[in-house]
């Protein structure tokens, strides 16, 4: 995803005014409670960000820098130290990482609770993925609707994506794909994967050819996750947009129904951003609608879409869900994952541009060992004596966090948690346990990737009919 500075105070102020206007228009148009609630929650989150940045409440019609009376009749904002999350920036001051319960409230999504996990288990007849059991996928929008459809033998499809900003992908990039592969397997449904090479061209200093070649290289890593070639279509925006009238028509429909004010409010665009950036959200939204893929779904517009993605992508799909009913399509459902922490700590997302912040899919066994031992933030004590006496802190220990992602055995993970917390297990031993999980995982991925030929990539990326069993 592109990187940008958090919006200036004035931009944030204008975003709030814009979002307030959106809320008003939804209310004046008697929109559904869900639409109004989610727009209001987005507004509240913007106001909280404003308070965190300005040190005072947002006041309607009183831009930053203008003196205003201190009292405010609106609802109280929470404390100033708010997490900041948008598609380009993820910031928190807490070593534990983002407060995801707060994020659910701010974004107006729903928590993936025991009840929903049990329902997924009943519907699929499969043990829920450890990403669900451990709260790595923690939030959703309308997943119950998807399960209703599935239980009534109605079709749905999966959509996820990747912004191919460099050839090197890190283990964090695998999270949505590992989970999406599981979803594809247990629900036996088609999947579309968008490679947003156009986005990367717009946001990064790349040529079009470079952006496209990154998309193809990244596609190899994605294919290596084990997706079913008969049920998966991977596409480059630069490639597919020109050959699919169904896709482009939806992009244009979305563009017509979303104002510049709205995208400014949602994404913090400024007047100096190029028009490509401003219209890009429509391109990421279009795959949410089934007739963007006529070769797969013909001209059907009623097939529900389920999008597994990291929570920072939610603003794109809030916009998508807002526009869907206005262009006659069902709203896509979403499953949100937590962020994969950087080796140095959970305060930020990992970055592919900082080699020591990440374990890359190209790393050797030796590099993995060195990076974990040298750079993985520890929740252990300063001395062995103290550690034995007081134990380590799993909440901030990156090695333990990584194990929650990659160690599938629940019993082993729980034993490690107990031993580390009690002080029976030292930091070096915890890091060793992680290295022993990561080294074979990466080696196996590299072996599978080697088997992905250009012909296989071409087949995955060719628009075609997929095999599935929809009425």
């Amino acid at each position: 995803m592109p990187n940008s500075e958090p919006a200036s105070l004035l931009e944030l102020f204008n975003s709030i005014a814009t979002q307030g206007e959106l809320v008003r228009s939804l209310k004046a148009g008697n929109a559904s409670k869900d639409e109004i609630d989610s727009a209001v929650k987005m507004l509240v989150s913007l106001k909280m960000s404003y308070k965190a940045a300005a040190g005072e409440d947002y006041k309607a019609d009183c831009p930053p820098g203008n003196p205003a009376p201190t009292s405010n009749h609106g609802p109280d904002a929470t404390e100033a130290e708010e997490d900041f999350v948008d598609p380009w920036t993820v910031q928190t001051s807490s070593a534990k990482g983002i407060d995801y319960d707060k994020l659910i409230v701010r974004f107006g999504s729903s928590k993936i609770d025991k009840e929903l996990i049990n329902r997924i288990e009943r519907a699929t007849g499969q043990r829920p993925h450890h990403f669900l059991r451990r709260g790595i996928f923690f939030s959703h929008r309308d997943m119950n609707q998807v399960l209703d459809a599935y239980e009534n033998k109605k079709p749905f499809y999966l959509y996820t994506g990747r912004g191919p900003s460099s050839e090197a992908m890190h283990v964090g990039h695998l999270i949505p794909f590992i989970f999406t592969k599981w979803l594809q397997d247990v629900f036996n449904v088609p999947l579309v994967i968008q490679m947003t090479d156009d986005e990367k061209y717009l946001w990064k200093d790349l040529t079009l050819d470079q952006a496209y070649s990154y998309a193809v290289e990244n596609a190899k890593d994605i294919i290596a996750c084990g997706f079913d070639i008969n049920k998966t279509f991977i596409f480059s925006d630069l490639d597919y947009m020109g050959m699919s009238s169904g896709f482009y028509k939806n992009v244009v429909k979305i563009q017509k129904h979303v104002t510049f004010n709205q995208v400014k409010g949602i994404f913090g665009f400024t007047d100096s951003d190029c028009i490509g950036k401003i219209s890009f959200p429509a391109i990421q939204a279009a795959p949410s609608f089934s007739n963007s893929f006529p070769q797969i779904f013909r001209d059907r517009t009623d097939i529900q879409c389920l999008i597994p993605c990291a929570i920072d992508q939610d603003p794109y799909f809030r916009m998508t869900r807002d526009v869907a009913p206005r262009i006659g399509y069902p709203k896509p459902a979403l499953l949100h994952s937590t962020f994969f922490p950087a080796l140095q700590g959970a305060q930020t997302k990992m970055s592919a541009s900082d080699p020591n912040s990440s374990i890359f899919l190209t790393d050797t066994a030796k590099q993995i060992k060195t990076k974990v031992n040298k750079h993985a933030f520890s929740g252990g004590r300063d001395t062995i004596e103290e550690h034995r006496q007081f134990g380590g802190n799993c909440d901030v220990d990156v090695s333990f966090m990584y194990l929650t992602f990659f160690l599938e055995d629940d019993d082993k993970l729980e034993q490690i948690r107990k031993d580390y917390t009690s002080g029976a297990m030292l930091t070096g031993e915890l890091k060793k346990a992680l290295i022993e999980v990561l080294q074979p995982l990466i080696a196996e991925h590299q072996a599978r990737r080697k088997e992905v030929t250009d012909e296989i990539v071409k087949e995955f990326m060719t628009p075609r009919k997929l095999s599935f069993d929809f009425q």
């Epitope: 809320v23 008003r24 008697n30 109004i36 609630d37 507004l43 019609d61 205003a68």
Partner: antibody, heavy 121, light 110 residues
Framework: EVQLLESGGGLVQPGGSLRLSCAAS????????MSWVRQAPGKGLEWVSA????????YYADSVKGRFTISRDNSKNTLYLQMNSLRAEDTAVYYC??????????????WGQGTLVTVSS | QSVLTQPPSASGTPGQRVTISCTGS????????VYWYQQLPGTAPKLLIY???KRPSGVPDRFSGSKSGTSASLAISGLRSEDEADYYC???????????FGGGTKLTVL
């Protein structure tokens, strides 16, 4: 179609009580802040009270504080105004109004037809 | 005595442009949105302008609102006989924690 229908007005003696109701239809009542606004015969508009969509934030005009209570029942799509210790100066047509803004800003896009409250001995 | 001050009356002939002022303070108009309402004889008020200058759908573009500092104004161009009504400005007041209206302006179309 959005509709707001006030009821419960009438003649009451000074010091007496009345409960006004406003039945809402044609929109998702629970998503909107609501207000009561009154107008004494031949006079201007006077805002009386406001309540947030969920009922957690409530505001009153100084002239009615401690005597009037605003409430809502979202399951019944109804807004209420309990008026106690009524005075002659409370005589007015009472309107309920829907606030379409997002922060109780007084953006009243729909109004009821009003109900007359007369306080007289 | 209203918190927001409006002239009690205004008049104009058909086709003319008339302006109604609304004066407040830093705690109301100075830091909050201004709203304008039209009340035709014997009817409930109707929202005419919201957020200082925006028109709800259905309100003709002959009506326009503006705000500067602690004052606001409503302009009606191309005056028509059906515009004869009472006009009220309103705004939230932070120091009172209350919504305040102007005293109203009776517009007569001559």
């Amino acid at each position: 179609e959005v509709q707001l229908l006030e009821s419960g007005g009438g003649l009451v003696q000074p010091g007496g009580s009345l409960r006004l109701s406003c039945a809402a239809s044609g929109f998702t009542f629970s998503s909107y802040d609501m207000s009561w606004v009154r107008q004494a015969p031949g006079k201007g508009l006077e805002w009386v009270s406001a309540i947030s969509s969920g009922g957690s934030s409530i505001y009153y005009a100084d002239s009615v504080k401690g005597r009037f209570t605003i409430s809502r029942d979202n399951s019944k799509n109804t807004l209420y105004l309990q008026m106690n210790s009524l005075r002659a100066e409370d005589t007015a047509v009472y309107y309920c109004a829907r606030d379409v803004a997002w922060d109780m800003l007084g953006d009243f896009d729909y109004w009821g037809q009003g109900t007359l409250v007369t306080v007289s001995s | 005595q209203s918190v927001l001050t409006q002239p009690p009356s205004a008049s104009g002939t058909p086709g003319q442009r008339v302006t109604i002022s609304c004066t407040g303070s830093s705690s109301n108009i100075g830091s909050n949105y201004v709203y304008w309402y039209q009340q035709l004889p014997g009817t409930a008020p109707k929202l005419l302008i919201y957020a200082n200058s925006k028109r709800p759908s259905g309100v003709p573009d002959r009506f326009s609102g503006s705000k500067s500092g602690t004052s606001a104004s409503l302009a009606i161009s191309g005056l028509r006989s059906e515009d004869e009504a009472d006009y009220y400005c309103g705004a939230w007041d932070d120091s009172l924690s209350a919504y305040v209206f102007g005293g109203g302006t009776k517009l007569t179309v001559l």
